[in-house]
Interface confidence: low
């Protein structure tokens, strides 16, 4: 690259016009403050490229760096970039203006920094002072860059005299920062809101003092920006929080909210996302299924559980046969509804030492101002079987009968069995099942009754034995889903004068 005039430093007059030319073997371009000012680009017959930058009506604000560089997308070496510094001494311009971020100088370690107060005239004497002090600090000054050195956490200003007036720069603030790897957490006051309610999200960064928050959210995509609020959590050192608050949410505000945090000093960044759902109105939804018939065992405790989702938080009531249930003082019933996640609930009805009277139709009703759900089921109390009576009789017909009566819920099954060898039964010999229709020796007659009051079945079974020629052990076994019970009687032949 060839620059004319070559520089590297030029002092030009106010209001003058000046032409800078740069040429090279590939297309070239002039840059000023990271931008490309208007310029004329050309290609000569010998294949060289040039760019001419004409500076007209120069003022002190044209003071600064100018770069000529190759105008292509490939990364080029530093020797293919030429720097030129132009001064335009201008008594109307004191210190060159700084961007706001240049006034804040952040340090993460003890290192040399530059306070970038620059003037338009390289002949001016510039001094550095603490903001509240008159004493000039012994720090070297470079007219093109500013004061460079090691500075404490203070505020500084630069001073110069132009003609007969003293000019002060803006104040520069030097901060030493706490910087670590970024740890971001995002949470919402609620992740489910109704239309018209507020969405409030918080993004918290731990361990860094200066970070930049950037939120992306559904509204932003449609160009409707929301200004987040950033604050420090004063009770926690180095906790910075950005709050995104969207009042009166709309359905379109449903979606992913992402907080991206960058820390420019070490170029760390992290982001976290959270999903927000805006619903038209509240809801209550059953999760999973509860069978319409439930069972409990007499005198045992039974917990009936219903899982549902709801927003906003619902009121939950339990009913038995349309009568509202509450925690009983006697401790027979316990009701609890607990929030297992933001919108998920588990409601439990616990019946302690279940009684027959607790059978019936149960309903759980969960509701709020927008929605309601109810779930009903029938509770059946299972009662273990009991053999209440086992008796033998000798009707005039000559046959012998054994009657077995028992109760239980659900309906008991009856099993008759007999053993002819009393000495070896039942340990060595398995008992013989009786009552099969194929056997002519015995006949069976069984009647079942349901007792509404006690909510259980009664089974009465009569076994008719045609001819008993030797003592017989007859066993009646009742079985249902929750247990079994057995009784035994010894049946002796008519001819024997005794019974065991």
């Amino acid at each position: 690259l060839v620059v004319t005039p070559p520089g590297p430093e030029l002092v030009l007059n106010v209001s003058s016009t000046f032409v800078l030319t740069c040429s090279g073997s590939a297309p070239v371009v002039w840059e000023r403050m990271s931008q490309e000012p208007p310029q004329e680009m050309a290609k000569a017959q010998d294949g060289t490229f040039s760019s001419v930058l004409t500076l007209t009506n120069l003022t002190g604000l044209d003071t600064g760096e100018y770069f000529c560089t190759h105008n292509d997308s490939r990364g080029l070496e530093t020797d293919e970039r030429k720097r030129l510094y132009i001064f335009v001494p201008d008594p109307t311009v004191g210190f060159l203006p700084n961007d706001a971020e240049e006034l804040f100088i952040f340090l993460t370690e003890i290192t040399e920094i530059t306070i970038p107060c620059r003037v338009t005239d390289p002949q001016l004497v510039v001094t550095l002072h603490e903001k509240k002090g008159d004493v000039a600090l012994p720090v070297p000054y470079d007219h093109q860059r500013g004061f460079s050195g090691i500075f404490e956490d203070r505020s500084y200003i630069c001073k110069t005299t132009i003609g007969d007036r003293e000019v002060d720069s803006d104040a520069y603030y030097v901060y030493r920062l706490q910087v670590s790897s970024i740890n971001v957490s995002v949470n919402a006051v609620q992740t489910v809101v109704r239309q018209g309610e507020n969405i409030t999200l918080m993004c918290i960064v731990i361990g860094n003092e200066v970070v930049n928050f950037e939120w992306t959210y559904p509204r932003k995509e449609s160009g409707r920006l929301v200004e987040p609020v950033t604050d420090f959590l004063l009770d926690m050192p180095y906790h910075i929080r950005s709050i995104l608050h969207i009042p009166s949410a709309e359905l379109e505000d449903s979606g992913t909210y992402t907080c991206n945090v960058t820390e420019s000093v070490n170029d760390h960044q992290d982001e976290k996302a959270i999903n927000i759902t805006v619903v038209e109105s509240g809801y209550v939804r059953l999760l999973g299924e509860v069978g319409t018939l439930q069972f409990a065992e007499l005198h045992r405790s039974r917990t009936l559980q219903v899982v549902f989702e709801a927003y906003p938080p619902p009121t939950v009531l339990w009913f038995k046969d349309n009568r509202t249930l509450g925690d009983s003082s006697a401790g027979e019933i316990a009701l609890s509804t607990r929030n297992v996640s933001e919108t998920r609930y588990v409601s439990e009805l616990t019946l302690v030492r279940v009684k027959v009277a607790e059978a019936g139709h149960y309903t759980m009703r969960a509701f709020h101002e927008d929605a309601e759900v109810q779930l009903s089921f029938q509770l059946q109390i299972n009662v273990p079987v009991r053999v209440l009576e086992l008796s033998e009789s000798h009707p005039d017909s000559g046959e012998q009968t054994v009657r077995c009566r028992g109760r239980g819920m659900p309906q008991p099954n009856i099993i008759w069995s007999a053993c002819r060898d009393l000495k070896r039964c039942p340990r060595e010999l398995p008992p013989t099942l009786l009552g099969n229709s194929s056997e002519e020796e015995s006949q069976l007659e069984t009647n079942v009754t349901y007792w509404e009051e006690e909510q259980e079945f009664e089974v009465v079974s009569t076994l008719r034995l045609q001819h008993v020629d030797r003592p017989l052990s007859v066993r009646c076994t009742l079985r249902n889903a929750v247990g079994q019970d057995t009784q035994e009687v010894i049946v002796v032949p008519h001819s024997l004068p005794f019974k065991v």
Epitope: L286, H368, V373
Partner: antibody, heavy 121, light 113 residues
Amino acid sequence: QLQLQESGPGLVKPSETLSLTCIVSGGSISSSSYYWGWIRQPPGKGLEWIGSLYYSGITFYNPSLKSRVTISVDTSKNQFSLTLTSVTAADTAVFYCARHRVMASSPFDHWGQGTLVTVSS
Amino acid sequence: DIVMTQSPESLAVSLGERATINCKSSQSILYSSNNKNYLAWYQLKPGQPPNLLIYWASTRESGVPDRFSGSGSGTDFTLTIGSLQAEDVAVYYCQQYYSTPFTFGPGTKVDIK
């Protein structure tokens, strides 16, 4: 657009079983937001709720009919059914299927056209 | 069961006049926790299915003309047709959905005088 359409025999003999089906179109019967119910209207009389069902199989019945009624769902066909056993002439009615929200704010907000079932020998 | 009664059994009103139907429940259907009355009104025309007009005793279903309004609380409710039109000739039923079994009133027939 949600539509409910009842279908089944228009004539049932006394003591037999009445069976009706309600086909749901334009919406899913498996929606967690709705119950699906049956209501009837005997000629010249008022409306009587028979029972309702949630897609998972949970049912609610009118106690006056409970011993004779079964409501079931077939989510694969997007339909639900009513069976009423041991019918008598008193069961002659227009039978409607209808939807009501689990959110009780909209009781029976969509109805079928209704189908007349006559019980006669 | 909650029993619903309606009065009158029938009424005839001139076109453009106001029609008022009353409905009474055998027990309160106002739920104190949310301060809502679990009552709906339906319109039933011959050969058509019932049409939901009002729910929560006073909230108009979308698409229902504003001449229909509901009021009342607890056990006493009213359906008012502000200015009767020819197409309003029908039988009107109230229904409670406070508890199962859901029950309907016997209906009120509205005709044009």
